[in-house]
Structure formats: C-alpha cells, structure tokens
C-alpha cells in the first residue's frame, strides 16, 4: 500500500518523498533496505535524508534499490518503501517507456502539460520544454509556472514532452529532466456559468468544539475539459492563505467527471481543533470560470455532543 516507484537519470538530481507521509513535525528516518544502514542527514553527503525527502544530488546508477522510510508518528512507527531506479543517459533522442511519467490528454480548450515531480524540487522559472528532443519555439508555446500551455492545439501536437529545470541545493545547481506523453482528444465540450453542488446557499454546518471539521466546496463548470475553472474557500472575504490561521487549510479534492460528462472540481476546507471563534466566521465557497463567479455562504454552529459512547447518558 505504501510503496512507490521512483526513477531518474544518472548525474541528475532525484528527490523522492516517503510514500508514508506524516505531519511536518514527525521525524522520518531513512534506511537502505538491503543493509538496514541508516542514510545520513548531513547535506554534505551526495545521498542524504531531509525529513520526508530522500535526496540524490546527483544520482548514480549504483543508487538503484529499495529504500525504507520510517515515520516516527505517535503510537506506531509507520513504514514506507521507495523503489528507486537510476538509468544511464540515452545517447539517442528516444525516451524509453520506463522513463515516462503518466500520459496527459489535452484539447483545444485545455492544453496544460504539468512537469512531473517538480513540486519536490527547489527550482526557479522558467522551465525549458522539449518535444521529441527539440526545444519548443514559437508563440504557441508558453511556459507558465510548472506547466506548459499550448495554444490552438492540433492533433500534430501529440508526442513526448520533456521539461528541464535546475534544482538548487545550498548554492549548488543540479539538472533534472522529466518526460511524459501528451495526447490530443477531439472533444465537443462546452463551458457554462459555475453551478455549486455543495454546500447549499446559507447552509448551517454543525461542528463539535475541539474536533476537526471538513467543508467541501463542489462545483461543475460544463462538459469536457475546461480551460479556466477554479473552486476555493474564503474566510470573511479573505483568501485562506492570507487569513493567517494555520488550523484552517484548504486542500484540492479530486477532479471529477460524472457519467453525464460534466467537469466538476472539489476543494476541501479542513478546520483542525474547531474553536469558538470559528463559529463567528463567514465561510464562502467560490466557483469561478470565464463566465463569472458564484458564491455560496456557510456558517458553523455548535453541535450539542450527544455521544453514543458517552459515559454519562
């Protein structure tokens, strides 16, 4: 359940995350599985552990193998396994299947190609993008943050796309490349004004003080792939990131495509250790696309704990 394949090229940086994730405050120890030898945390080592991350700076073919990470969580030490394979660089242009990340599909309306695994690295824009080993040039191609946008997608745009970026670690630079296939689907989609499925307008959500609470903002935007669509939460009209309450975080849910073909998005608002003052806030679920913005407001109310396993009924 908690084993993950990771791969990279020799002489490039490779950063692997422990498949068994814990809270940021938890200690994570890394070991070579075969020898049970601890991986050092000192950054002067070529291979070192840094919390949930295992860093190969740079990687060598001999680094291939299974690595064990142990998350020192309360009650149990939880174990994960990272199966790492480092390959020799290919002399020709072909990228073998075993180096490919998951295929993504695009259409005329949505042609984003995300650079795989980039979130694990300390990189700075811009990314370099290649298609079938050729550097991409022309106004149709736009490198934006961690993805590539192709304007006016055509079937000829299908192919293997490689992103290349530099990882910086304590002033030293390491190259990283990642490749994935892009397919073009001819799709008769449409976009409409956002429809919020949950929460209901002016919904009252019952919560227990001291417990955790989740609010889901779910909206649909039309049929097929959407070029611009977003759902988010605001607190008293302020973005979650700007509100400055670490107990309250939003987390992207799964992209949903229902049997009727509607394209929908979820955003979960997680409130840890609900406090009295949280009941005074206004929670706004916002859904927006090119057509406009729709807002549904939720308020929290205290749930009177009628606990079936209370010792005093």
């Amino acid at each position: 359940k908690f084993s993950k394949q990771s791969w990279g090229l020799e002489n490039e940086a490779l950063i692997v995350r422990c498949p068994r994730q814990g809270k940021p405050s938890y200690t994570v120890d890394w070991y070579y599985s075969q020898t049970n030898k601890s991986i050092p945390t000192q950054e002067r080592n070529r291979v070192f552990a840094s919390g949930q991350l295992l860093k190969f700076l740079p990687a060598e073919v001999a680094d291939s193998g299974i690595y064990t990470c142990i998350v020192r969580s309360p009650t149990f030490n939880r174990t994960g396994y990272a199966n790492v394979t480092i390959y020799k660089k290919q002399s020709d242009c072909n990228v073998p299947d075993y180096l490919m990340y998951s295929t993504v599909s695009g259409s005329e309306k949505n042609s984003k190609i995300y650079c795989p695994t980039i979130d694990l690295y300390n990189w700075t824009a811009p990314l370099e993008w290649f298609k079938n080993c050729q550097a991409l040039q022309g106004s149709r191609y736009r490198a934006h943050k961690s993805f590539l946008v192709i304007d006016n997608v055509m079937t000829e745009d299908a192919g293997d796309y490689t992103c290349k970026f530099i990882h910086n670690e304590n002033g030293a630079n390491y190259s990283v490349t990642a490749t994935r296939s892009f397919t073009v689907k001819d799709e008769q989609g449409f976009s409409l004004f956002p429809v919020i499925g949950a929460p209901a307008q002016n919904e009252i959500k019952e919560v227990e003080i001291g417990k955790n609470a989740n609010l889901t903002c779910s909206a649909c935007f039309g049929k097929g792939t959407q070029f611009l669509a977003a759902v988010l939460w605001q607190l008293n009209g302020t973005k979650i990131t700007d509100f400055g309450e670490p107990r309250i975080q939003q987390e992207e849910g799964q992209n949903q495509s229902f049997s009727n073909g509607l394209a929908c998005l979820d955003m979960v608002l997680r409130i840890a250790d609900v406090k009295e003052e949280d009941l005074l806030l206004q929670y706004d679920c916002l859904a927006l696309n090119l057509h406009g913005l729709r807002r549904h407001t939720v308020r929290l109310s205290r749930k009177n704990p009628i606990d079936h396993h209370s010792i005093y009924c």
Epitope: K1, G22, K23, S25, Y26, P74, T75, R78, N212, H308
Partner: antibody, heavy 122, light 111 residues
Framework: EVQLVESGGGLVQPGGSLRLSCAAS????????MHWVRQTTGKGLEWVSA???????YYPGSVKGRFTISREDAKNSLYLQMNSLRAGDTAVYYC????????????????WGQGTTVTVSS | DIVMTQSPLSLPVTPGEPASISCRSS???????????LDWYLQKPGQSPQLLIY???NRASGVPDRFSGSGSGTDFTLNISRVEAEDVGVYYC????????FGGGTKVEIK
C-alpha cells in the same frame, strides 16, 4: 451510531486455536488504526495487537508469533487469530478504535466493544 | 517498553469531595508534534473501558467538566473536582506514544 461488536470467544484447550472477529459500524473503518486489548479476571488492561490502515501489524512480545491481527476493510471487520493458546491468555478480549491513521488525528481509544470471553483450560 | 505506574491502588472517596489519581511513565510521553500521548479511562463495574481524557488534558465528548487531566513529561494527574456516586470504578492511565501500555489501575469507591 459508532459501534464495535466482538464475537468468536469460547472455551479452548491449551495449544488450541481461536479466531475472534469484530464488526465495525457507524464510521469510516478503513482509515482508523484498530486494536485488540484484553483483561484477565480481576486484573488490569493489556494491549494485545494493532493494525494500521496500511495493514502493518504490531504486537507485544507476549503474543508475537502466536497471534495474528488482520482487517477486511470491505467488510468493516477486524480479526484476531490466536494460536498456541496458553492458560495465561484467558481473558475478556476487547476490540477498540485508535487514531485516524490517514490524517494522523488522535482522540484516544475512543470506541470499545463489549468484549468477548476466551477461556483456555483443559 | 514504556512502563506506567499508577497511585494509589485504591481510593476511598466521599461524594462532593475532590479526588486525584497520579500516573507516572518510565519515559517522557511528549512527541515531536508537541502533544503528550497520555489518556485516562474509566471502567465501571461490568462495563467496557470508556475514554475520559486524551492527550493529557483534553476531555472526551460527553465527559462532565468535573474531570480534568494535567501534567507533562512523565508525571500526570487525573482530577475529579467533586466526586459523584456514579464515578465509582477502576481508572486507568494509558500511554499511546509507543504502542499502548496501561497503568495498573486505581479503584475508586465510596467511603
């Protein structure tokens, strides 16, 4: 209603085997760590085994190699296979819910079953 | 293994009076996340154990506010501000830092 119901206890001879079951309802069973805790007559509580959401298992030295905990998330069920039973294993066995192993939230061992009695005697 | 030691073994109480139970662990129960993994449970006669306090000082849902938990490191206390007749039973402390270990129990009975 959040509930745990144990079954499978009974009388067994020393060296024999027994399989306990625990049926969970009213919560998302698959995300929780689950425990077996036992209590010998007139004595205190002793932790017997645990299983986390990944299926990793944990045991104290007193039962390691003899007891096996397992879970079937599709059936919301927890099991304890007890082999090579000894007189000292005679106890009431409780199934109990631990922390949320997905979000790493811990609110104590907050749900307990009613217990099932295991008697090891010739 | 972490060893939990409870005292007293038996505690005769008078309804309306306060009572306290002590629990000591063989090592600190403070985790890197900042919480003390120490719980208190009450087992009433003929019943399953029931959670009173978790993470050292958090009252479980439905538990009266006359129950409170305190302490840090290796020393913890369960306080009952005014004992009621229904509070009789055996109280256990339990550490959940490294698997689970229970204290030996404190039997609370009415004088």
């Amino acid at each position: 209603e959040v509930q745990l119901v144990e079954s499978g206890g009974g009388l067994v001879q020393p060296g024999g085997s027994l399989r306990l079951s625990c049926a969970a309802s009213g919560f998302t069973f698959s995300t929780y760590d689950m425990h077996w805790v036992r209590q010998t007559t007139g004595k205190g509580l002793e932790w017997v085994s645990a299983i986390d959401l990944a299926g990793d298992t944990y045991y104290p030295g007193s039962v390691k190699g003899r007891f096996t905990i397992s879970r079937e998330d599709a059936k919301n069920s927890l099991y304890l296979q007890m082999n090579s039973l000894r007189a000292g294993d005679t106890a009431v066995y409780y199934c109990a819910r631990g922390g949320d192993g997905y979000n790493y939230d811990y609110y104590g061992i907050d749900v307990w079953g009613q217990g099932t009695t295991v008697t090891v005697s010739s | 293994d972490i060893v939990m030691t409870q005292s007293p073994l038996s505690l005769p109480v008078t309804p309306g009076e306060p009572a306290s139970i002590s629990c000591r662990s063989s090592q600190s129960l403070l985790h890197s996340d900042g919480y003390h993994y120490l719980d208190w449970y009450l087992q009433k006669p003929g019943q399953s154990p029931q959670l009173l306090i978790y993470l050292g000082s958090n009252r479980a849902s439905g538990v009266p506010d006359r129950f409170s938990g305190s302490g840090s490191g290796t020393d913890f206390t369960l306080n009952i501000s005014r004992v009621e007749a229904e509070d009789v039973g055996v109280y256990y402390c339990m550490q959940a830092l490294q698997t689970l270990t229970f204290g030996g129990g404190t039997k609370v009975e009415i004088k």
